[in-house]
């Protein structure tokens, strides 16, 4: 299956060139997507190429600049946000990254009515998070771990919380572990639909052990970075949820939302908050042992100005075969009656599907079914439900958008995207305007990405928003590798794989093989998406075959595959990579003396264990920022899949699954170990311990550290990293430079 733009004439072959490493490092062949910033049913904002903020009206076809690039430049703004009443715009500048999602910035408020910046009662700096209310122009923001409210941008702020303290108490923003492993956001506050109430989380990290590492910088003495970071089995943050009336915030103050009794009886997490109406809110909670989740619907009791969460409105989701949910527990999408909702969870056959819950989970009505999975519910309107799944043609690595008519009986299902641009587009996401009047489709591949605008009633394409013409032209003289997505059937397990083949691939020849692995629980590497990246270069220029394999533990193929790794990380993921390699060798075009494996993060863990499997299959391999022991990684993530590192739980497998325990087995492979010293996520400690174990076992290996770099190894480190890894692989495969 060739998933690349087709060539016009073979005679052009000689004018074509292979990809270079420089192409990849320069981002020469990066693509653009277009996500409208919807501001109504038929209007959206977009930042033009020359940095003007332009408002587009789909129905009138008109557009006008609401904020000029001159205004943006006057404060060096890199981002903006229009207030819902369209009177003000916040301008964001001085962006300073913190963790994966979090950053601080300086905010300026621009008054569109008089064309001036709001003076007086300016916002403090730097701000950790800022957002408009959903209606009007109230502002909520977090500064120094406390939440503030402004009724209007020029008003003095009202301080909602007072106990915020760096690394101790976080209000309205998550601590490290909640940001990375639970919420996946930089914020932990939520406006009610009409802005009457503001809900927020308070995280108390007082008792959490701290990870400390050196940041070398340029000074005479390094700084020490301290982060409250609960590793597996350690003390966790204590979370509380509060709601405040933003119209009259002072009198009653924040009211705590009660935790369901069955959750509060032991350690627990808050997992998400969904407003239903201004006076109804839905909270999701999770036991620390993450196989029980409770969805709690709470109502405002006006007489007491409190929130009541009756037991009759508690819905329990429990997994008996693994953990609750996929990567996260899914969130509900409420219907117009403001009590029933749609939610994705496992059906009786162990596939994640959409269910409709009206009274109890036990009486849920299954909306989708089959040996495939519903992946995301985008929007529920009065008559339609839009969702994505990997149903079409039974390819788990595809995403198509479907519409189910819920207004009619029986409900009818239509695939909106399956036949739009079938060869080019098999992996979609969508972005909907208010009431799903219009929507944008963003196709990520396998062909060159394209973004289009559609009518929400008829699904007709209205216009192309971005088609990456420049990229298409730039690729015309590039010899791109061929890509295949196929499956292996082994011992009742289906192993989907993507193989990236050199442009002049010849099955009768032998090629070096590089396995790229991630393999983490609920991940998916074999996806029908477009990419011109490092492995594209290795295939195009260096003549390698690259393979990605989704083994046990990966997502969207049912619970049997997903939960196979439960409480046993580091076993089946590795076995399945090895099994796939053996199958690839049987295909006849792999040089079995030149097989390598590489991975980053969880992939670094799997590649390390594969190299140390003692199979003799791998000549060499690379681990970038690997986990080396699950005792070193974050509680929320690790315990979800592994339970607790205690004698009466799963300590034995925690100990058995370390990379260090297999140090001896690295003797017969070439191993390159790479890590950033300022990795806040997978701590440098992981690689330090691998290195120590290898030294103690007197095993030779290669290593590279990146000073002051985090888990992403960004900037100039990226160039150095890929250059270094390229040299290592070429040397391993005896390829000339």
């Amino acid at each position: 299956i060739v998933l690349r733009p087709s060539r016009v004439h073979n005679s052009e072959e000689n004018t074509m060139r292979a990809l270079t490493l420089k192409d990849i490092l320069n981002g020469t062949f990066s693509y653009k997507t277009f996500f409208p910033n919807w501001i109504s049913g038929q209007e959206y904002l977009h930042q033009s190429a020359d940095n003007n903020i332009v408002l587009y009206n789909i129905e009138t076809g008109q557009s006008y600049t609401i904020l000029s690039n001159r205004t943006m430049k006057s404060v060096n703004a890199s981002n903006y946000g229009l207030s819902p009443d369209r009177q003000f715009v916040y301008l964001e500048s001085d962006y300073s990254k913190l963790w994966r999602y979090s950053y601080t910035a300086t905010y300026y408020i621009y008054d569109l009515s008089n064309g001036e910046f709001v003076r007086g009662n300016e916002l403090p700096r730097p701000i950790q998070y800022l957002c408009w209310s959903p209606v009007g122009s109230k502002l909520a923001y977090v500064y120094q771990n406390n939440i503030y409210l402004k009724q209007r941008p020029g008003d003095p702020p009202f301080q909602i919380t007072f106990n915020g303290r760096e690394n101790k108490i976080f209000n309205g923003i998550p601590d490290w572990v909640y940001e990375e492993e639970m919420l996946a956001t930089k914020y932990a506050l939520w406006w009610s639909p009409n802005g009457k109430f503001l809900a927020y989380a308070e995280f108390n990290d007082t008792d959490i052990p701290v990870i400390a590492y050196s940041y070398y910088g340029d000074e005479q003495y390094p700084r020490t970075i301290n982060i409250p970071y609960p590793k597996a089995g350690a003390k966790n943050p204590v979370v509380r949820i509060f709601i405040i009336d933003t119209t009259y915030p002072a009198y009653v103050g924040p009211q705590e939302v009660p935790v369901p009794a069955m959750i509060a009886s032991s350690d627990y997490y808050f997992s998400w908050l969904t407003w239903v109406t201004d006076e109804r809110v839905c909270l999701q909670w999770l036991k620390r042992v993450q196989n029980v989740s409770v969805l709690s619907i709470c109502d405002f009791r006006e007489d007491w100005q409190t929130w009541d969460c009756p037991k009759t409105q508690e819905h329990i989701e429990e997994s008996r075969t693994g953990w609750a949910g996929g990567f996260f527990v899914s969130t509900p999408v409420f219907s117009y009656d403001a009590i029933s909702y749609y939610k994705i969870f496992s059906d009786k056959d162990g596939y994640k599907h959409i269910h409709y819950i009206k009274d109890t989970v036990e009486n849920a009505i299954q909306i989708t079914s089959g040996k495939w999975e519903a992946i995301n519910i985008f929007r529920v309107t009065q008559d339609s439900l839009f969702y994505s799944s990997n149903e079409f043609e039974e390819y788990p690595g595809r995403r198509n958008i479907y519409r189910i008519s819920i207004g009619s009986y029986p409900p009818s299902k239509k695939c909106v995207t399956c036949h739009l641009r079938k060869e080019r587009c098999q992996y979609y996401t969508a972005s909907f305007s208010d009431y799903a009047k219009y929507y944008a489709l963003v196709c990520y591949g396998p062909g060159i990405p394209i973004s289009t605008l559609h009518d929400g009633r008829t699904d007709q394409e209205i216009k192309i928003l971005e088609e990456n013409k420049e990229l298409e032209n730039a690729l015309k003289n590039i010899q791109l590798p061929k890509e295949e997505i196929k499956k292996l059937e082994v011992d009742e397990i289906t192993l989907w794989y993507k193989m990236i083949l050199p442009p002049q691939f010849d099955r009768s020849k032998k090629y070096p093989l590089l396995i790229q692995v991630y393999g983490g629980p609920c991940s998916q590497s074999v996806r029908s998406v477009f990419a011109v990246n490092w492995i594209s270069y290795l295939a195009s220029k260096e003549g390698m075959v690259i393979a990605l394999v989704d083994g046990r533990g990966t997502a969207f193929q049912g619970d049997k595959l997903l939960y196979a790794v439960y409480r046993k990380l580091g076993v089946y993921e590795v076995e399945d990579q090895i099994t796939a390699v053996r199958k690839f060798i049987e295909m006849g075009f792999i040089d079995e003396k030149r097989i390598a494996i590489w991975g980053w993060s969880y992939g670094g863990y799997v590649s390390s264990l594969a190299l140390a499997s003692g199979t003799g299959l791998f000549k060499c391999g690379i681990a970038v920022a690997p986990v080396s022991s699950w005792e070193y990684y974050a509680s929320v993530y690790t315990e979800r899949f592994m339970g607790l590192p205690t004698k009466d739980d799963n300590l034995e497998h925690y100990k058995n699954s370390t990379v260090m325990a297999r140090a001896e087995y690295f003797r017969n492979v070439d191993y390159l170990l790479i890590h950033g010293t300022a990795d806040d996520n997978v701590h440098f400690q992981n690689s330090a311990q691998i290195a120590k174990a290898l030294v103690n076992a007197q095993v030779d290996f290669q290593a590279m550290w990146y000073s002051d770099q985090n888990h992403g190894l960004s900037g100039l480190s990226t160039n150095h990293l890929y250059t270094h890894m390229t040299h290592f692989l070429k040397q391993c495969f005896s390829l000339s430079d």
């Epitope: 301080q159 009259y248 002072a250 009198y251 009653v252 103050g253 009211q255 705590e256 007491w304 409190t306």
Partner: antibody
Framework: QLQLQESGPGLVKPSETLSLTCTVS??????????WGWIRQPPGKGLEWIGS???????YYNPSLKSRVTISVDTSKNQFSLRLNSVTAADTAVYYC??????????????WGQGTLVTVSS | DIQMTQSPSSLSASVGDRVTITCRAS??????LNWYQQKPGKAPKFLIY???SLQSGVPSRFSGSGSGTDFTLTISSLQPEDFATYYC?????????FGQGTKVEIK
């Protein structure tokens, strides 16, 4: 110096409506920092909060009395009033008006009127 | 409603004594607790807010502490003018509720 003064009839018949007014002097009722409240104390008993009002008219009431209580404000006169209908003997008490300061939180009653005894009797 | 329970209901003490009155809330009220003093025939007088902050003009022999559900009012050295009834009051939620009072009498 802020002063609060309750006024109104000292005797109300059962089932009728108790009406009291609190006049604020030495300061404006139209401040965003205060609510203005009514608290009562039956003879020989403890204190019971009735309700509070903001100068804009936003009110909070004790749920146990809410169905019978109305508190209103007249900013032009610097006054706020209490109406309690369908009274019984159990409503006999000294009625206090007070200023409730709300910023910074928490709310507390820092200035009180001297109180007026209202007896419910036929 | 949040119930406020004071103990003791009454106590006898002498001038110069250290007196402690406790107030317990039926659920957590954070630090949102206030103390008042009332003398017979008079309106209550405000003493302490936010559990421990002394109102200006209130003698420093009065102090408050606690958070969550348990709070105390302490008079370090009882003076003749301190004989009165003391009330705690929570302002964490609606309705505002008072304790039943603690009467401090002369021994």
């Amino acid at each position: 110096q802020l002063q609060l003064q309750e006024s109104g009839p000292g005797l109300v018949k059962p089932s009728e409506t108790l009406s009291l007014t609190c006049t604020v002097s030495g300061g404006s009722i139209s401040s965003s920092t205060y609510y203005w409240g009514w608290i009562r104390q039956p003879p020989g008993k403890g204190l019971e909060w009735i309700g509070s009002i903001f100068y804009s008219g936003n009110t909070y009431y004790n749920p146990s009395l809410k169905s019978r209580v109305t508190i209103s404000v007249d900013t032009s006169k610097n006054q706020f009033s209490l109406r309690l209908n369908s009274v019984t003997a159990a409503d006999t008490a000294v009625y206090y008006c007070a200023r409730e300061i709300i910023e910074p939180r928490p709310g507390y009653f820092d200035y009180w009127g001297q109180g007026t005894l209202v007896t419910v009797s036929s | 409603d949040i119930q406020m329970t004071q103990s003791p209901s009454s106590l006898s003490a002498s001038v110069g004594d250290r007196v402690t009155i406790t107030c317990r809330a039926s659920q957590s009220i954070s630090k949102y607790l206030n103390w008042y003093q009332q003398k017979p025939g008079k309106a209550p007088k405000f003493l302490i807010y936010a559990a421990s902050s002394l109102q200006s003009g209130v003698p420093s022999r009065f102090s408050g502490s606690g958070s969550g559900t348990d709070f105390t009012l302490t008079i370090s050295s009882l003076q003749p003018e301190d004989f009165a009834t003391y009330y705690c009051q929570q302002s964490n939620s609606i309705p505002r509720t008072f304790g039943q009072g603690t009467k401090v009498e002369i021994k």
